[in-house]
């Protein structure tokens, strides 16, 4: 029942061109190139894509033509290595071009930058955008793919095609509307927020595969798909997991044409076998390809089958527990994970994986003991504290969120995390803590049964952002330890960190706390970021400051900004009142 066609193809590039069609082929090659060479100008990428596309067409016409038998990595790598300014723009990445495949592609992958030095995307006026869209729709949409791909080098390529389709639809509709801005801006905001979330979720999948291996990803997939498709039998879930792992391995490895092709095949298979997978797929399967794949990926959990028997009989009481474990370790653990996950849509995937790890560790120890059954008889009792820990943490943090609201909840987390890992850069601490704080509005509104999967799995995605940003410039052994020891225990590891007593407070620098009139024209979000940046810097200067001290200083700061933004001579106000504020803050914090 293998989904993926593995017939021998004389020309891989011709095969993918025919499968995907010219439009998708060009879009995916552009994404691939922009994700590898993140600094190259748009026009250069378009030129390279056009050259590759013309070449692919010659191979479609005659698969035996010169170079048509080369692998996609060879073809694309050769093309990237023709870029004239490679050494000047990318430095040591140019050394990749001296390598042979597959080492060359691995080298390019290692140079992907999660935080490229690129200007923030500024949204032009609506009329300017609509004119550009009407003048050259194709270029406008390619520019969108290019700008997103170069800023998000691990963005899930077939999903980016779906975002581009929605982006196009928004402009097609809204540029004809009476009030273009009212129509377009909310749609663009939604696409931006969904896009950031999609990018972060995919980044975790790639980190899981690349840092912890295929087994870790497969375990995650077994748990998630078993929650989503609890009526599907284990053999079906295993098959889907194998295929999904292949799709994500390809995308994370830069094999975007294969990835998109295989994802389409997987969606087709799922829809052809809905009856044995899930009753929730009907609507998804009526949609066109890109919408269908997206819909399947987001589909709600099916209802659990009635009267599922106790797990203890097969996994604790059976005489064959150790035989099963010895004969087929990973399959047996996979069955355990499947059976546990399908019964617990109320648990986070990471919790389910912790339970499976505990079960595995217990069997590893007990199956070598004199009386294995006596040894593992109470294994399920070991699960209780593991389940209660995230439950209690979520309860406490949702109470705090409801009490404070999002902005102040973010501030509480900013203080908490700056004290844990003060060596981390201020922009990273602000970005990560703001995202951690969004868990409140995202998840605390849910009933108890949905809170944990929402919250803890979201936190895994956000903490992975911290891990990949920190990996680029490591500054904290504690971050490295939490990020690398165990994928599923990252969140508990960070939660358990106390104030870093070894940290030497940062020298006070008045410049850090000097503000200007430009703050008054910023959006509410940007103004919050400015204040939160100041808060992190305060904590770095005075890590032992109490909540009350920090609150007093922040309240004074908010009043100062409000006062000066209302003043006639704003700049003078910021200069004079700013000095007073810095002096008062130093006194309040004993700096």
């Amino acid at each position: 029942r293998g989904v993926f066609r593995r017939d021998a193809h004389k020309s891989e590039v011709a095969h993918r061109f025919k499968d995907l069609g010219e439009e998708n082929f060009k879009a995916l090659v552009l994404i691939a190139f922009a994700q590898y060479l993140q600094q190259c100008p748009f026009e250069d990428h378009v030129k390279l894509v056009n050259e590759v596309t013309e070449f692919a067409k010659t191979c479609v016409a005659d698969e035996s033509a010169e170079n048509c038998d080369k692998s996609l990595h060879t073809l694309f790598g050769d093309k990237l290595c023709t870029v004239a300014t490679l050494r000047e723009t990318y430095g040591e990445m140019a050394d990749c071009c001296a390598k042979q495949e597959p080492e060359r592609n691995e080298c390019f992958l290692q140079h992907k930058d999660d935080n490229p030095n690129l200007p923030r995307l500024v949204r032009p006026e609506v009329d300017v955008m609509c004119t550009a869209f009407h003048d050259n729709e194709e270029t406008f949409l390619k520019k969108y793919l290019y700008e997103i791909a170069r800023r998000h080098p691990y963005f899930y390529a077939p999903e980016l095609l779906f975002f581009a389709k929605r982006y196009k639809a928004a402009f097609t509709e809204c540029c004809q509307a009476a009030d273009k801005a009212a129509c377009l801006l909310p749609k663009l905001d939604e696409l931006r927020d969904e896009g950031k979330a999609s990018s972060a979720k995919q980044r975790l999948k790639c980190a899981s595969l690349q840092k912890f291996g295929e087994r870790a990803f497969k375990a995650w997939a077994v748990a998630r798909l078993s929650q989503r498709f609890p009526k599907a039998e284990f053999a079906e879930v295993s098959k889907l997991v194998t295929d999904l792992t292949k799709v994500h391995t390809e995308c994370c490895h830069g094999d975007l044409l294969e990835c998109a092709d295989d994802r389409a095949d997987l969606a087709k298979y799922i829809c052809e076998n809905q009856d044995s997978i899930s009753s929730k797929l009907k609507e998804c399967c009526e949609k066109p390809l890109l919408e269908k794949s997206h819909c399947i990926a987001e589909v709600e959990n099916d209802e659990m089958p009635a009267d599922l028997p106790s797990l203890a009989a097969d996994f604790v009481e059976s005489k064959d527990v150790c035989k099963n474990y010895a004969e087929a370790k990973d399959v047996f653990l996979g069955m355990f994970l499947y059976e546990y996950a399908r019964r617990h849509p109320d648990y986070s995937v990471v919790l389910l994986l912790r339970l499976a790890k505990t079960y595995e560790t217990t069997l590893e120890k007990c199956c070598a003991a004199a009386d294995p059954h006596e040894c593992y008889a109470k294994v399920f009792d070991e699960f209780k504290p593991l389940v209660e820990e995230p439950q209690n943490l979520i309860k406490q943090n949702c109470e705090l969120f409801e009490q404070l609201g999002e902005y102040k909840f973010q501030n509480a987390l900013l203080v908490r995390y700056t004290k844990k890992v003060p060596q981390v850069s201020t922009p990273t601490l602000v970005e990560v803590s703001r995202n951690l704080g969004k868990v409140g509005s995202k998840c605390c509104k849910h009933p108890e049964a949905k809170r944990m999967p929402c919250a803890e799995d979201y936190l895994s995605v956000v903490l992975n952002q911290l891990c990949v940003l920190h990996e680029k410039t490591p500054v904290s052994d504690r971050v490295t330890k939490c990020c690398t020891e165990s994928l599923v225990n990252r969140r508990p590891c960070f939660s358990a960190l106390e104030v870093d007593e070894t940290y030497v407070p940062k020298e006070f620098n008045a410049e850090t706390f000097t503000f200007h009139a430009d703050i008054c024209t910023l959006s509410e979000k940007e103004r919050q970021i400015k204040k939160q940046t100041a808060l992190v810097e305060l904590v770095k200067h005075k890590p032992k400051a109490t909540k009350e001290q920090l609150k007093a200083v922040m309240d004074d700061f908010a009043a100062f900004v409000e006062k000066c933004c209302k003043a006639d001579d704003k700049e003078t106000c910021f200069a004079e009142e700013g000095k007073k504020l810095v002096a008062a803050s130093q006194a309040a914090l004993g700096l």
Epitope: P305, F332, E339
Partner: nanobody
Framework: EVQLVESGGGLVKPGGSLRLSCAAS????????AAWFRQAPGKEREFVSA???????TYADSVKGRFTISRDNAKNSLYLQMNSLRAEDTAVYYC?????????????????WGQGTLVTVSS
Amino acid sequence: EVQLVESGGGLVKPGGSLRLSCAASGRPVSNYAAAWFRQAPGKEREFVSAINWQKTATYADSVKGRFTISRDNAKNSLYLQMNSLRAEDTAVYYCAAVFRVVAPKTQYDYDYWGQGTLVTVSS
């Protein structure tokens, strides 16, 4: 607890075909290994065929190419399609199940058994 009930046995001429069924109740057995054993009068019970969770089948040499084991997990049922039957296939056929990842071939490995169905091959 798993209960197993076989059906489909009977009298058939040499060269004929029969399809045995085994219905499981008590709990779903899609992840269980399931097997058919047989016992001819005055002989030991012997392994015929087994199938695992992945629907991978194994057969005794004496039935290879003639018998096909299958399962329908939606119906919680196991089947044995017997073609080209011979007089030496005459026996009581038993269905068995156990929660094992790798399907065993020894009767002592199986936890659950049906009461058996008689197959007689005679002209």
